[in-house]
């Protein structure tokens, strides 16, 4: 089958810092040594672009410095982490890995991982 | 709205060039890549080439390769395909295509005439 | 190259009736790179289903996309007068990106 398979965990939790980070694994049908991975958040039928960054095999995974995404790769696998999340970011993410060079480009989606975040409660005023 | 505007189509001699353009508005033209799809008259439609996100990496139809060149200008949101050594089996209509966040062409443009007549 | 084979060439129908496109892949394509378009004479295509069996916007859910492996299918439950048309699959997994030759549904 002359296509790409990616898996991502089905369910995440952010942390109370509104941190949620997850793997994003592709199995490569080809020998690329140009990756492009980019986050889609779906919420009902709408689909936004989270974050997107282009890497050499061997080198680091760079996003934009304004994102809010950060990552490593590691051979056929991206540790992504997102942050600054907040419960109204709940939502479906979605990693979308392609195969930019050498020939042929090859386009890899996963399932998507559901990112649920819940907003800490205000700490209480104390007296002292 | 989201939208492609095709221009540049014509009547052309075989050997000569022309040079399509397609302008992109109504969403980050950076973020997705940009294919031209022709089709002959009467016939199908048959992809002809794509370019990234930032420009770099570029892909043909075997039919095209070493004549067209697909190039994108970002900071006009303008899509180009230039066009050599035209051939009468190169006559048809030129669309440009938006590749959506999930692979297929969800946007397309009213698609531009090209006649390589002599 | 993935060479997609549509099936019939011509489909000859009534508005009400139920419509079955076929597209046969030369080899296996994954299911999420699977895409209908619709094409209107003197118009451009317009992408009716994404990944074998999601709608794209706008799309009325008489038209349904299945399929797997080397096999896929759309399908019109009742034909709308608006439908008669041409319809292209398409795959998108890998380059170079190729099209079936066309199904042309008209009215009988």
């Known amino acids: 089958c002359k296509a790409m398979h990616v898996a991502q965990p089905a369910v995440v939790l952010a942390s109370s810092r509104g941190i949620a980070s997850f793997v994003c694994e592709y199995a490569s049908p080809g020998k690329a040594t140009e990756v492009r991975v980019t986050v889609l958040r779906q919420a009902d039928s709408q689909v936004t672009e989270v974050c997107a960054a282009t890497y050499m095999m061997g080198n680091e995974l760079t996003f934009l410095d304004d994102s809010i995404c950060t990552g490593t790769s590691s051979g056929n696998q991206v540790n992504l982490t997102i942050q600054g999340l907040r419960a109204m970011d709940t939502g479906l993410y979605i990693c979308k890995v392609e195969l930019m060079y050498p020939p042929p480009y090859y386009l890899g989606i996963g399932n998507g991982t559901q990112i649920y975040v819940i907003d800490p409660e205000p700490c209480p005023d104390s007296d002292f | 709205q989201v939208q492609l505007v095709e221009s540049g189509g014509g009547v052309v001699q075989p050997g000569r060039s022309l040079r399509l353009s397609c302008a992109a508005s109504?969403?980050?033209?950076?973020?997705?890549?940009m294919h031209w799809v022709r089709q002959a008259p009467g016939k199908g439609l048959e992809w002809v080439a794509v370019t990234w996100y930032n420009g770099r990496n570029k892909y043909y139809a075997d039919s095209v390769k070493g004549r067209f060149t697909i190039s994108r200008d970002i900071s006009k949101s303008t899509l180009y395909l230039q066009m050599n050594s035209l051939r009468v089996e190169d006559t048809a209509i030129y669309y440009c295509?938006?590749?959506?966040?999930?692979?297929?062409?969800?946007?397309w443009g009213q698609g531009t005439m090209v006649t390589v007549s002599s | 190259e993935i060479v997609l084979t549509q099936s019939p060439g011509t489909l000859s129908l009534s508005p009400g009736e139920r419509a079955t496109l076929s597209c046969r892949a030369s080899?296996?394509?994954?299911?999420?790179?699977l895409a209908w378009y619709q094409q209107k004479p003197g118009q451009a295509p317009r992408l009716l289903i994404y990944g074998t069996s999601s709608r794209a916007t706008g799309i009325p859910d008489r038209f349904s996309g299945s399929g797997s492996g080397t096999d896929f299918t759309l399908t019109i439950s009742r034909l709308e007068p608006e439908d008669f048309a041409v319809y292209y699959c398409q795959q998108y997994g890998t380059s170079p990106w190729t099209f079936g030759q066309g199904t042309k549904v008209e009215i009988k």
């Open positions: 295509a938006r590749g959506g966040y999930y692979g297929a062409f969800d946007i």
């Open positions: 109504g969403f980050t033209f950076s973020s997705f890549g």
């Open positions: 080899q296996s394509v994954s299911s999420s790179y």
